[in-house]
């Protein structure tokens, strides 16, 4: 996470340091596009993989085991087989070029129309290339050629099912349908706090307004991601830290524009598993009333 050395609130009467908000949003978009994008665009497949990894690609079955005898095994959302992929229509409406912020790709036609923020759902999406998906500020990650190719992604047959335990009043088992195997984790550089500048030769990418540096690292295979592979894991930011890292005051109510600046960081934090502690599978080792999910708010 970029850290600021500046005092934030005194300089902006609105309670937001817009320069910092834009730069931080771009940083998180860059992280996400590095993991799931290719050539500065997010394909439908990459978008699906992102949704899959943050756990919202399909309905999942949750078993809740309560401590009390009279509440045994409740099943919620048993229709976990039903995929929601059919909801994602060609991605035009997901990343049209109107909203706001951050980082944007433009297609090779030279139309430099890139969207900028997180919720992309409003104007002027006709005729847009569905790859115009980086929000305001999402910019070319430096290891563009090192991005995982959709073709290299982990196939369903290679994926196993994993159970995450969250122990609190009751034990909640979230049964995920597709999760990474130990052998399919990303290298340690996936989510480093501030990616180093790459000084290798620049080339013009097929997206009109971006230059992409040749990668100095091996291409990563597969979209599956776990922050446990990271020697420098991303911190789990609570509400206050998310706000201050974007140059926003913690006492001031957020409007929609300001909330939009936070969206990439929120998604990135979920995707990087920043707020999950992976505990032993042996229940006996889990002390009562402990949490494998850090309290983030």
């Amino acid at each position: 996470f970029p850290q600021t050395t500046e005092k934030i609130s005194p300089n902006w009467e609105s309670g937001i340091n817009v320069d910092l908000a834009i730069s931080t949003r771009q940083y998180h978009l860059q992280q996400l596009f590095y993991r799931y994008g290719e050539n500065n665009s997010l394909s439908v497949e990459g978008f699906r993989k992102l949704l899959q990894n943050i756990g919202i690609d399909k309905i999942k079955r949750i078993h809740i085991h309560h401590d009390h005898d009279h509440h045994s095994d409740h099943e919620h959302h048993s229709d976990h087989e039903r995929h929601s992929d059919h909801e994602h229509h060609s991605e035009h409406e997901h990343h049209s070029d109107h909203d706001h912020h951050s980082h944007h790709n433009h297609a090779a036609s030279g139309k430099n129309k890139r969207k900028a923020l997180c919720p992309d759902h409003d104007s002027d999406s006709s005729g847009k290339d569905p790859r115009n998906s980086q929000g305001k500020g999402a910019h070319r990650p430096e290891h563009a050629s090192g991005r995982r190719n959709v073709k290299d992604s982990v196939s369903a047959s290679e994926v196993t099912s994993t159970v995450y335990n969250t122990v609190s009043e009751g034990t909640h088992f979230l049964e995920t349908i597709e999760t990474p195997r130990p052998g399919k984790l990303f290298p340690k550089d996936v989510s480093s706090s501030t990616p180093p500048s790459v000084t290798s030769k620049s080339r013009v990418s097929r997206l009109a307004g971006r230059k992409t540096n040749e990668s100095v690292s091996e291409p990563r295979k597969g979209f599956m991601y776990s922050r446990n592979t990271n020697e420098n894991p991303q911190e789990c930011f609570n509400a206050s830290k998310l706000l201050t890292s974007h140059g926003m005051g913690i006492q001031v109510p957020l409007n929609a524009t300001e909330f939009n600046y936070l969206c990439p960081a929120i998604i990135n934090q979920i995707d990087a598993r920043s707020c999950l502690i992976h505990t032993s599978e042996k229940k006996a080792e889990i002390p009562p009333k402990t949490y494998s999910l850090q309290i983030a708010w």
Partner: antibody
């Protein structure tokens, strides 16, 4: 105190390159992106490009073939290079920290033989 | 690219008056607009960001409004030091683009 100070030549020969260094203080290049803008009487203010915290860059498509922005975080310096300048590239070139009041003092560049 | 149009190149006003400078975007830019003031021989100085939020140190006689495609910078109780050129800029989509400027002249 946030400051951006520019240094570079004022006169460039046609077809030659322009190099400007922007040295920042009061903030870190690992926290903020730095943008480049130019201003000319004929074309007004034009956004040229940006280098972000991780070293990634975005360029105005109109300049991508001849523009390069890089930086040295440890020295708090951002480097701007534009190739193949012509007379219509005569302008004041600014570095700036995003859409804020923090701009460099500007470098007046005249392209002339 | 998004075109930011400031239809009035020059505006004439008197000290104490109220004046409004307008800017129109060629497509929706939400509230991602900055207003700059530039005095001769100086770098632009940002007055307003996010269409309506004043930067600190900017007198409260400067107010910004608008969203989507239509934006206004209003200067109430104009002072002689407000003689300058005013630019709008959108930072919603790349490339960021500027309006052509409106020069404020004091009668």
């Amino acid at each position: 105190q946030v400051q951006l100070k520019q240094s570079g030549p004022g006169l460039v020969q046609p077809s030659q390159s322009l190099s400007i260094t922007c040295t920042v203080s009061g903030f870190s290049l690992t926290t903020y992106g730095v943008h480049w803008v130019r201003q000319s009487p004929g074309k007004g203010l034009e956004w040229l490009g940006v280098i972000w915290t991780g070293g990634t860059t975005d360029y105005n498509a109109a300049f991508i073939s001849r523009l390069s922005i890089s930086k040295d975080n440890s020295k708090s310096q951002v480097f701007f290079k534009m190739n193949s300048l012509q007379a219509n590239d005569t302008a004041i070139y600014y570095c700036a920290r995003g859409p804020s009041s923090y701009w460099g003092q500007g470098t007046l560049v005249t392209v002339s033989a | 690219d998004i075109v930011m149009t400031q239809s009035q190149k020059f505006m004439s006003t008197s000290v104490g008056d109220r004046v409004s400078v307008t800017c129109k975007a060629s497509q929706n830019v939400d509230t991602n607009v900055v207003w700059y003031q530039q005095k001769p021989g100086q770098s632009p100085k940002a007055l307003i960001h996010s269409a309506s939020y004043r930067y600190s140190g900017v007198p409260d006689r400067f107010t910004g409004s608008g969203s989507g495609t239509d934006f206004t910078l209003t200067i109430s109780n104009v002072q002689s030091e407000d003689l300058a050129e005013y630019f709008c800029q959108q930072y919603n989509n790349y490339p960021w683009t500027f309006g052509g400027g409106t020069k404020l002249e004091i009668k």
